[in-house]
């Protein structure tokens, strides 16, 4: 099966790498614009220069292209706790990230929110916090893991999944209740 190519890909494939086919004359291959620039005017003829202009402030192109406009710089999402790691330049988009001791949780492929790494109180660190993953905790005896926090077994209800982990404690509590003084 031949993969379906879009019109632009079909046109580009006729020219050697680093060139694109002139939109009005398919016998002409124009040189693509360097990153940090965009296409202002197509080359007038074979072997003649493409008119490329530098991206204006607040816009960029990160690779060679024949775009009629530069791309708008991304803005870091403050409401997601994001901070700017590096500013947008003409050839690179803004890089957003999280503060120290935070990790990213992705709500979608391109949208992340910053959260504080778990400290594993009443437990130990099994896996350290990473850029895209919270700390993995192992809880001490008498505690169970709930939403990656170590919670006392005294908060374990019989209907919850913690019953297996907290079974001795639950039995002890039950035994204490049953052995009332007469």
């Amino acid at each position: 099966l031949v993969p379906h190519l879009g019109d632009r890909e079909k046109r580009d494939s006729v020219c050697p790498q680093g060139k694109y086919i002139h939109p009005q004359n398919n016998s002409i291959c124009c040189t693509k614009c360097h990153k940090g620039t965009y296409l202002y005017n197509d080359c007038p003829g074979p072997g003649q220069d493409t008119d490329c202009r530098e991206c204006e402030s607040g816009s960029f192109t990160a690779s060679e292209n024949h775009l009629r406009h530069c791309l708008s710089c991304s803005k870091c999402r403050k409401e997601m706790g994001q901070v700017e790691i590096s500013s947008c330049t003409v050839d690179r988009d803004t890089v957003c990230g999280c503060r120290k001791n935070q990790y990213r949780h992705y709500w979608s492929e391109n949208l992340f929110q910053c959260f504080n790494c778990s400290l594993c109180l009443n437990g130990t660190v099994h896996l350290s916090c990473q850029e895209k993953q919270n700390t993995v905790c192992t809880c001490h005896a008498g505690f169970f893991l709930r939403e990656n926090e170590c919670v006392s077994c005294s908060n374990c209800k019989k209907s919850l999944e913690c019953t297996k982990l907290c079974l001795p404690q639950i039995e002890n509590v039950k035994g204490t209740e049953d052995s009332g003084t007469t």
Epitope: S108, Q113, F115, E147, E149
Partner: nanobody, 116 residues
Framework: EVQLLESGGGLVQPGGSLRLSCAAS????????MFWVRQAPGKGLEWVSA????????YYADSVKGRFTISRDNSKNTLYLQMNSLRAEDTAVYYC?????????WGQGTLVTVSS
């Protein structure tokens, strides 16, 4: 077949509370972020809240922060939205959804009307 069924909407006075539920089936519920979105009369969709598979990570739109609480019970395949201190501007059809931003699956919605 993926199904999401919202319930719990109704008419409530300003300052009142409601708890919405969303029963999910047909997919591995505890593997997905889940979302509440709403649509006020004559307006577009607004992303209200989100919760991660474990329930540890949550997101709230500024308009509902401090008043709404999202939660989930993976053992019951159910998503919840506790809504307190309701305002007239919270009047909308509330939908639960999986996946953002395309919200590939969502329910039929439940209408919340805040009026005196």
């Amino acid at each position: 077949e993926v199904q999401l069924l919202e319930s719990g909407g109704g008419l409530v006075q300003p300052g009142g509370s409601l708890r919405l539920s969303c029963a999910a089936s047909g997919f591995t519920f505890d593997a997905y972020n889940m979302f509440w979105v709403r649509q006020a009369p004559g307006k577009g969709l607004e992303w209200v809240s989100a919760i991660s598979p474990s329930g540890r990570e949550t997101y709230y739109a500024d308009s509902v922060k401090g008043r709404f609480t999202i939660s989930r019970d993976n053992s019951k395949n159910t998503l919840y939205l506790q809504m307190n201190s309701l305002r007239a501007e919270d009047t909308a059809v509330y939908y639960c959804a999986k996946r953002y931003p395309d919200f590939d699956y969502w329910g039929q919605g439940t209408l919340v009307t805040v009026s005196s």
